[in-house]
Amino acid sequence: KKEDGESTAPTARPKVLRCKCHHHCPEDSVNNICSTDGYCFTMIEEDDSGTPVVTSGCLGLEGSDFQCRDTPIPHQRRSIECCTERNECNKDLHPTLPPLKDRDFVDGPIHHKHHHHHHHHH
């Protein structure tokens, strides 16, 4: 099991993963479900007016390790959590906006929320 903050290299899944998508659904999605070889994610960020907006969807394996890393962006409050342990696992992800005073650190943790053990199949 990967705990919050523990770094993990993405590994190829043996099969496709279905994720819930909201505000981030690709053309091929049906009933707000997308498919990926990588991760499901849920993200919260502030829009231009400062209103929190939640989006969710699929991240391809390639580049997802970077994307799932909560690297601070100057003048932008954002938090992302990723998961792979079951289909639509991102329904249970609830990232929160970081407090403003914490936005001066350089490297954030990778947020892999696993509510169940993630068995790696070989």
Epitope: K15, V16, D28, R86, H121
Partner: antibody
């Protein structure tokens, strides 16, 4: 080697239900999706639905959502499809098929379902 | 639902001839994020279950003879048998796995003269 074993035939009465089985062997059952496909005599192939044995997540073709229910028994590596309120239109060969990435790399031999009184 | 249309519905060829069959989809099967076409081809011999020949439009499944060649992109796809053999007598189906429900073409029946 990968095998998906299905009974050769089933004969059931109109209005009844039937539970078709598909026993998987030669691979890790939870590592792949299982699909069910219908083929009527001399006709094409229709996808009924899919189930991920690892978390029992299912997706159905809307056409079959009130007709078919997909389940698995992980302990015996067996997938099941229950069909209800059977009519002559349900007479067909039903295949189970395995997928990793939504194309079907192994198929069972099919169960010929006959609905007749 | 994506509609898959195959043509011709049947054809008769002599051993050694080149065979081409077409599969057209009602919308593009090309995913922009990875530039792959989500289309597969299957062979179904009489009395048997379907067998995977090609996936991602042009990737031959392991163990499939190299005379089977898949090509095409977007909405137009072709399965070519470069030199047909007697054992290729079968129905051939295309399938899209771009968007659920996964759908199949009506098939092309290949007969050997």
């Amino acid at each position: 080697q990968v095998q998906l074993q299905q009974p050769g035939a089933e004969l059931v009465m109109p209005g009844a239900s039937v539970k078709l089985s598909c026993k998987a062997s030669g691979y890790t059952f939870t590592n792949y999706w299982m699909h069910w496909v219908k083929q009527r005599p001399g006709q094409g192939l229709e996808w009924i639905g899919e189930i991920d044995p690892s978390d029992v997540y299912t997706t159905y073709n809307q056409k079959f959502k009130d007709k078919a229910t997909l389940t698995v028994d992980k302990s015996s590596s067996t997938a099941y499809m229950q069909l209800i309120n059977l009519t002559s239109e349900d007479s067909a060969v039903y295949y189970c098929a395995r997928s990793g990435w939504d194309y079907f790399d192994y198929w069972g031999q099919g169960t010929a379902l006959t609905v007749s009184s | 639902d994506i509609v898959m249309t195959q043509s011709p519905s049947s054809l008769a060829m002599s051993v050694g001839q080149k065979v081409t069959m077409s599969c057209k989809s009602s919308q593009s099967l090309l995913k922009s994020n990875n530039q792959k076409n989500y289309l597969a081809w299957y062979q179904q011999k009489p009395g048997q279950s379907p067998k995977l020949l090609v996936y991602f439009a042009s990737t031959r499944e392991s163990g499939v003879p190299d005379r089977f060649i898949g090509s095409g992109s977007g909405t137009d796809f072709t399965l070519t048998i470069s030199s047909v053999q007697a054992e290729d007598l079968a129905d051939y189906f295309c399938q899209q796995y771009y968007s659920t429900p996964w759908t199949f073409g009506g098939g092309t029946k290949l007969e050997i003269k």
